[in-house]
């Protein structure tokens, strides 16, 4: 069973590990044969996918989805206007930004059109179902001979997010991790100049604007470290899509940035 969906990175994915379980706060069902549970995720408050396991039906059925917002100005029942399909059978619905109201109770109803009494209704708190995009534009600054500062950006949701930074050296198997609040900045006070470090970050819509449990995907990793010249042991390593901007370009401050930033730096 392959459902084509968009992952939190914004890429297409056809694997089943996207389907994260979130129990509805309320569940009602009519008829003897239960309908599959609907699972909704709001991606960066740009769109929302509500999906169900279409293969759980005893025979292929194009289930229909309706939704509304409880006790609000948006309480008019709406039909799904953009279905997602799995093997030509409906398996989800995508709602666009203008149809998403995070702080109103979202009511979603799945129905079997061939048996209208067979329906299931769930109520969801959308602010707890937000998954941000992965952090972007990771940069490293050298604050002192042994101290590094990691910065990153998030698209749109900055103050609503908490973050988890992980780092390790080349010969570490496990990561050291550190929680970071909405300030999206992390300092590593003691860095061994002989080692190569890898950093990565992920973000979560919690706790200021919601109580989401699910993290974003990990950022692309950024590296700092030892495969550098003997003359300057603190020179940043050149890695994959990352390039070094010279100290002159940055007024004496050394900084590792992504290819995307590099173009931006030279063109503006």
């Amino acid at each position: 069973l392959n459902t084509t969906i968009l992952t939190p990175n914004g890429n297409e994915d056809t694997t089943a590990d996207f389907f994260l379980t979130t129990m509805p706060t309320d569940s009602l069902s009519v008829s003897t044969l239960p309908l599959p549970e609907v699972q909704c995720f709001v991606f960066n408050v740009e769109y929302m996918n509500c999906t169900w396991n279409s293969s759980s039906e005893p025979q292929p059925t194009n289930l229909t989805l309706h939704y509304w917002y409880k006790n609000s100005d948006n309480d008019k029942v709406q039909k799904c206007s953009h279905y997602l399909f799995s093997e030509e059978i409906t398996s989800g619905c995508q709602l666009q930004k203008k149809e998403i109201h995070l702080y109103q109770t979202f009511v979603v109803q799945l129905q079997d059109p061939r048996e209208p009494r067979r329906q299931a209704t769930q109520m969801l708190k959308l602010q707890n179902l937000v998954i941000p995009w992965a952090p972007e534009n990771l940069t490293l600054h050298k604050l002192s001979e042994s101290q590094l500062e990691l910065n990153w950006n998030n698209r749109f949701l900055n103050h609503c997010l908490e973050h988890l930074v992980q780092y390790r050296t080349d010969w570490d198997h496990s990561w050291t991790e550190q929680s970071v609040d909405y300030r999206h900045k992390f300092s590593l006070p003691s860095v061994d100049g002989q080692k190569r470090y890898t950093f990565r970050v992920r973000s979560r819509f919690n706790p200021l604007c919601g109580s989401a449990q699910h993290w974003s995907e990990w950022s692309h990793p950024i590296h700092w470290g030892s495969n550098t010249s003997k003359e300057n042991p603190f020179l940043f390593a050149l890695e994959a899509e990352q390039k070094l901007i010279s100290e002159e370009d940055l007024g004496g401050e050394q900084k590792l940035i992504s290819e995307e930033d590099l173009h931006h730096h030279h063109h503006h």
Epitope: D13, T15, D17, D172, H173, S174, W175, T176, E177, A240
Partner: antibody, heavy 120, light 107 residues
Framework: QVQLVESGGGVVQPGRSLRLSCAAS????????MHWVRQAPGKGLEWVAG????????YYADSVKDRFTISRDNSKNTLFLQMNSLRAEDTAMYYC?????????????WGPGTLVTVSS | DIQLTQSPSFLSASVGDRVTITCWAS??????LAWYQQKPGKAPTLLIY???TLQSGVPSRFSGSGSGTEFTLTISSLQPEDFASYYC?????????FGGGTKVEIK
């Protein structure tokens, strides 16, 4: 669910080569580090080699360094172990294992194994 | 390299017994330790990681403790399905290493 299936084992003479494969499914293979672990008959577990999610770093046990090469093809969801200059002491059941995505990255899924016998 | 020493290597016990297995690391590894169970002819399965965190789906009779250089795996009340071999693994740094194993057999 996660599934790992090793193949390529068999009987081989000392000094010869063998290539093991591990076919992965049920998870986003390109996001996870992978490893080979072996177990000689009646003995304990021995970690052999590991590779980062993108293949950018590879790690080996001293006993196989310069003889074994770990690699992966993320487009085919497959992990490999190229074993050269095989010795009698390489005889073992070879398991591929997937890292769990936690800070400690233990091995949360293992294949059933493929048996390699090095004998003249 | 970090060496792990497991004790005992062999243990005979009865259903209902409380069983403790110890793993020593040759240098401090904080809590970077995992425990695996292996039944004959099968691949290992993860029981505990981060020294004391129970893997999802593992019965609560299994517990882990320790930090630094000494770690223990405890089975509070041995069940028939627990007769197997148990291995510790250090997760701190490469090369990764396993303990020699402890075989738990029926008395």
């Amino acid at each position: 669910q996660v599934q790992l299936v090793e193949s390529g084992g068999g009987v081989v003479q000392p000094g010869r080569s063998l290539r093991l494969s591990c076919a992965a499914s049920g998870f986003n293979f390109r996001n996870f580090g992978m490893h080979w672990v072996r177990q000689a008959p009646g003995k304990g577990l021995e970690w052999v080699a590991g590779i980062l999610y993108d293949g950018s770093s590879k790690y080996y046990a001293d006993s196989v360094k310069d003889r074994f090469t770990i690699s992966r093809d993320n487009s085919k969801n497959t992990l490999f172990l190229q074993m050269n200059s095989l010795r009698a002491e390489d005889t073992a059941m070879y398991y591929c294992a997937k890292e769990e995505d936690t800070a400690m990255v233990p091995f949360d899924s293992w294949g059933p194994g493929t048996l390699v016998t090095v004998s003249s | 390299d970090i060496q792990l020493t497991q004790s005992p290597s062999f243990l005979s016990a009865s259903v209902g017994d409380r069983v403790t297995i110890t793993c020593w690391a040759s240098q401090g590894i904080s809590s970077y330790l995992a425990w695996y169970q292996q039944k004959p002819g099968k691949a290992p399965t993860l029981l505990i990681y981060a020294a004391s965190t129970l893997q999802s789906g593992v019965p609560s009779r299994f517990s882990g403790s320790g930090s630094g250089t000494e770690f223990t795996l405890t089975i509070s009340s041995l069940q028939p399905e627990d007769f197997a071999s148990y291995y510790c693994q250090q997760l701190k740094s490469y090369p990764l290493t396993f303990g020699g194993g402890t075989k738990v057999e029926i008395k």
